[in-house]
Interface confidence: low
């Protein structure tokens, strides 16, 4: 059955070389004295991407990242030496790794770095307008970076700068043990989470921070932190990691007598991303790696996309889960986690919850408490001892929307674009991996909008060497994706519709919401452009309905590639054919010489099928004829290649091997009469090369050819060898067999 596609594989897989050759990636390969291009800040208005790296801050042009400005911000020699004396690595640790890069106001950015284990912050002037072209460090104004940037560059930081105040989740000490969520800058006293209390934070790895409004009243605004941490004893048997979402009220100024300069509204809940397994045991993806908030229409209710990996070293897997803010809020309004009972296990708190409910932001909306400093003591006491919620937050549809477990990579980053297509709106995910590839995945609603099918459109290699992707930003204005890693920064378009092919069916099969068939090409789909030829079917990807009558004939350039291959009796030959789409299934047909009838090729000892094509072993005369390679995808059949195989009998070959050039040999003439003079130059030698059964090795064969060549050269001094490089060419061709079918222009394997 040819209908069943290979849905879990990317339809297109593009190597770094293919990406470069097709002008689909622009890379900034880093500076010799820098690395760690991990901290991104996108400024759509100025059309700049600011990137914090080792000892540098860059300002890249969003149109083309090859155009950039840079600020060098290293540490002093004294600081570097102190760091080295403390036993740190001079290259990997004793430098200024930029960890915080945020817009401070209309004219300045705020940046913090590790400062060689001595965190430091400053302001960067960027001017009022893009045309000001200002990008400079405020050298006169450096600030202590403690509680803003970690000391250790290996540690993750999550930060958010709003209304002149910096919220950061980071480590506040040299040893990297005192983790906290801080609020610094601004006019108020710094605030942090309770110190040395594992119930609040237990060795967290911070991922990101986001401001989300609760209501139309700004007093209810909350800052949400996403992180992963060690599960608290009793929460889980054995050492385990839990993914978390934490909340704090923006207007939390700490308590009056207790929790002074500490958060009084901090609450956290577990994020579950799991798939049901056999025997009722779920497979959990607990290692939260990245979060993306899709704000659409209602900023109070963004959809949260989370990238998770497994904790196990044995079972490597990744998943993407989606969460709704209404589910998050429901959990924060649910029971608190409480330790009780003889085993001191975690149970839902059943007692009286003080008023106003801990975690509620002080506002006139609820009970008239203007400030957290006015909260009753019992509220503060309860908040201190009950920071965690009992119920976890489950993903939409109770399962991941993307799962990858059968691959040699793990997910690291995600950005999502909501795309208007002909038949609805689709979320297109760009997922970064730890081997430097980007997956482009579209989630397609099946029966209901939350019952989603994942379609892996493309897998693109964006860096020359495998390197983990550590930062990603998406510009809707430029329709470009920006990717950061230790090695550098890459830029690629969100859509490259032309790569899908030159036929309506190929465009339709791609199921890329960005693309549609416009009557003559696969091109960018704009909902506003009322072009009637636009064909697109994201939901089903069915070309038979949408394209069946749009010609796939020769004058439209869809005729199959035609090749002639010569094989020697009793030897083997390989017919190469691999479709552009990895999701297509290939089947072969054989048509005997002078026969109309085509039969499907059955695999046996004589014929072996591979992903690259068909291997015919021990060739016989009856194998001569036409071999047709067809690709089948979603019921659509496309003929990719027609190979005419000519099998030469051994007797004939002996004749060719030993006949002199001057010799007549009617058989030779008969066999080569279809060839051009330039082809005749080398074809005779070539035919001997194909596993001639009477020659032990290629060396032996080449030796014979060269001897004969020398002999002929002596006999005819005026003869000029027209193909002195032919063996080099042949051997190169023997090497490069794993190629796409659109690269057929090669000699001498295809005459």
């Amino acid at each position: 059955n040819y209908q069943n596609g290979k849905n879990n594989v990317p339809r297109l897989k593009l190597s770094y070389k293919e990406m470069l050759e097709s002008n689909n990636v622009i890379t900034f390969n880093g500076l010799a004295n820098s690395s760690s291009y991990h901290t991104f800040l996108l400024d759509e208005e100025r059309s700049r991407l600011y990137v914090g790296a080792k000892d540098h801050i860059f300002s890249f042009d969003l149109v083309n990242i090859k155009d950039f400005q840079k600020i060098v911000w290293p540490v002093s020699y004294t600081r570097r030496d102190e760091c080295k004396w403390a036993g740190k690595d001079i290259l990997k640790e004793c430098a200024n790794f930029i960890k915080v890069l945020k817009a401070y106001n209309q004219t300045h950015l705020y940046a913090c770095g590790t400062g060689a284990f001595h965190p430091i912050c400053t302001y960067i002037e960027i001017g009022h307008h893009p045309e000001d072209n200002i990008f400079k460090l405020e050298n006169s104004h450096f600030e202590n970076g403690r509680g803003k940037s970690p000391y250790d560059p290996k540690l993750l930081t999550a930060s958010l700068l709003i209304d002149g105040e910096l919220y950061s989740g980071t480590a506040a000490d040299f040893m990297g043990r005192d983790f906290a969520i801080f609020r610094t800058l601004g006019h108020h006293h710094p605030i942090r989470t309770e110190q040395h209390d594992s119930r609040w934070l237990n060795d967290p790895k911070f991922i990101s921070a986001h401001l989300i409004s609760e209501s139309d009243n700004p007093e209810d605004d909350k800052v949400y932190f996403f992180f992963r941490e060690n599960a608290i004893d009793g929460e889980h048997s054995g050492k385990a990691t839990h993914a978390r979402i934490g909340q704090i009220c923006k207007n939390d100024f700490g308590g009056h007598r207790s929790l002074v300069n500490k958060w009084t509204t901090f609450l956290k809940a577990r994020l579950i991303c799991s798939v049901p397994g056999p025997n009722g045991i779920d497979t959990h993806f607990d290692e939260l790696q990245d979060v993306f908030l899709m704000n659409f229409k209602d900023p109070k209710n963004p959809v949260v996309y989370g990238v998770f990996t497994t904790s196990s070293n044995i079972f490597k897997g990744s998943a993407v889960c989606m969460y709704s803010m209404s589910d998050v809020r429901r959990v924060f309004l649910g029971p608190y986690a409480h330790r009780d009972g003889p085993n001191y296990q975690w149970v839902p708190y059943q007692g009286r919850v003080p008023y106003p409910r801990p975690g509620t932001c002080p506002s006139k909306t609820f009970g008239g408490f203007d400030s957290t400093k006015d909260l009753p003591d019992d509220v503060i006491t309860f908040a201190r001892s009950h920071p965690a919620m009992y119920n976890p937050v489950f993903p939409m549809n109770n399962r991941p929307i993307v799962i990858k477990t059968d691959v040699n990579y793990q997910f690291t980053q995600i950005v999502v674009d909501r795309v208007d297509a002909e038949d609805g709106q689709y979320d297109v995910m760009f997922i970064g991996t730890d081997v430097g590839t980007v997956l482009k995945v579209v989630s397609i609603p099946k029966e209901t909008w939350y019952d989603l099918e994942e379609v892996l459109l493309e897998e693109m290699t964006v860096f020359r060497e495998p390197t983990a992707i550590s930062a990603m930003e998406l510009s809707t204005k430029q329709q470009q994706l920006y990717i950061g890693s230790t090695a550098g920064v890459a830029q690629l378009p969100l859509h490259r519709c032309d790569i899908y092919g030159k036929a309506c069916a190929e465009c339709c099969l791609a199921r890329d919401p960005y693309c549609a068939w416009d009557g003559s090409a696969c091109s960018r789909y704009f909902p506003t452009a009322k072009r009637r030829t636009r064909r697109q079917d994201i939901r089903n990807g069915d070309p038979l309905t949408h394209c069946s009558d749009l010609h796939h004939d020769n004058h439209h350039g869809h005729s199959p590639e035609e090749r002639i291959i010569y094989g020697v009796e009793n030897s083997s030959t390989f017919l190469e054919c691999s479709p552009k789409s990895q999701r297509a299934l290939v089947y072969w047909q054989f048509q005997r010489r002078n026969e109309e009838r085509k039969e499907e090729i059955r695999v046996d000892d004589h014929i072996i099928r591979t992903d690259q094509g068909l291997l015919l072993r021990s060739l016989q005369q009856k194998d001569s004829g036409n071999y047709l390679c067809h690709a089948v995808e979603h019921g659509f059949i496309q003929t990719l290649l027609k190979v005419t195989l000519e099998v030469i009998d051994t007797e004939h070959l002996e004749e060719l091997l030993h006949k002199d050039d001057d010799g007549d040999g009617s058989k030779t003439k008969e066999m080569s009469n279809s060839m051009t003079p330039s082809q005749k130059v080398w074809y005779r030698d070539f035919m001997q090369l194909i596993n001639h059964p009477n020659l032990n090795t290629m060396d032996e064969f080449c030796e014979q050819v060269w001897k004969r060549d020398r002999k002929q050269r002596r006999q005819r001094p005026g003869h000029t060898p027209g193909n002195s490089n032919k063996w080099k060419h042949l051997q190169e061709n023997k090497k490069g067999r794993n190629r796409r079918t659109h690269e057929f222009e090669r000699a001498p394997r295809s005459v």
């Epitope: 038949d423 003559s520 009322k530 064909r535």
Partner: antibody
Framework: AVTLDESGGGLQTPGGALSLVCKAS????????MQWVRQAPGKGLEWVAA??????WYGAAVKGRATISRDNGQSTVRLQLNNLRAEDTGTYYC???????????????WGHGTEVIVSS | ALTQPASVSANPGETVKITCSGG????????YGWYQQKAPGSAPVTVI????KRPSNIPSRFSGSLSGSTNTLTITGVRADDEAVYFC?????????FGAGTTLTVL
């Protein structure tokens, strides 16, 4: 078999509004473009409107007055025509495209038609 | 505008050809359809769509062919019940159009 049944025609008053419904059966309507074509008495065929999933197109004579919509669940296509004029009189046919292209070239099935008379 | 002859006539058994030109193109290719209407106000019947496709209920004596930008409807072995008005239809990106119709009279 593919069937298209139009309804909603009849005597209409100038300046009024008209709502025609086409009920489709025998095929999965959501995959195809649907069109409305009309014919004034003694005249030829005139294309009115077309809908393909979400995109819509209208003929010059009805642009700004017509709205075409579809309900794939109910397998219906609706044509709403406002500010009716005497020249809107005729038989209105619902038509299905053989593939998704909005063109008279691709119509492979027609409804029996519903007659509309605009008169005071 | 689509151009087609106003009328054609033929004796039973003869071959009739009706041409239609002036259609719009999709990506450089021209597409036409042919519709038979036996009486004014009665439902048209598609005899050819997409230049040469014939619906399953249409007899094989009806065929369509495209030459350049002109489409030809051919009825081989015309019969009395083929008497009708034949409209051609086409489109491009900006509009969908029908010809004025060709009246086929079977003598």
């Amino acid at each position: 078999a593919v069937t298209l049944d139009e309804s909603g025609g009849g005597l209409q008053t100038p300046g009024g509004a008209l709502s025609l419904v086409c009920k489709a059966s025998g095929f999965t309507m959501s995959s195809y473009e649907m069109q409305w074509v009309r014919q004034a008495p003694g005249k030829g065929l005139e294309w009115v409107a077309a809908i393909y999933t979400r995109s819509t197109w209208y003929g010059a004579a009805v642009k700004g007055r017509a709205t075409i919509s579809r309900d794939n669940g109910q397998s219906t296509v609706r044509l709403q025509l406002n500010n009716l004029r005497a020249e809107d009189t005729g038989t209105y046919y619902c038509a299905k495209s053989g593939i998704g292209l909005n063109s008279a070239a691709f119509i492979d099935a027609w409804g029996h038609g519903t007659e509309v008379i605009v008169s005071s | 505008a689509l151009t087609q002859p106003a009328s054609v006539s033929a004796n039973p058994g003869e071959t009739v050809k009706i041409t239609c030109s002036g259609g719009g193109s999709y990506g450089g290719s021209y597409y036409y359809g042919w519709y038979q209407q036996k009486a004014p106000g009665s439902a048209p019947v598609t005899v050819i769509y997409t230049n040469n496709k014939r619906p399953s209920n249409i007899p094989s004596r009806f065929s369509g062919s495209l030459s350049g930008s002109t489409n030809t409807l051919t009825i081989t072995g015309v019969r009395a019940d083929d008497e009708a008005v034949y409209f051609c239809g086409s489109a491009d990106n900006s509009g969908t159009a029908f010809g004025a119709g060709t009246t086929l009279t079977v003598l």
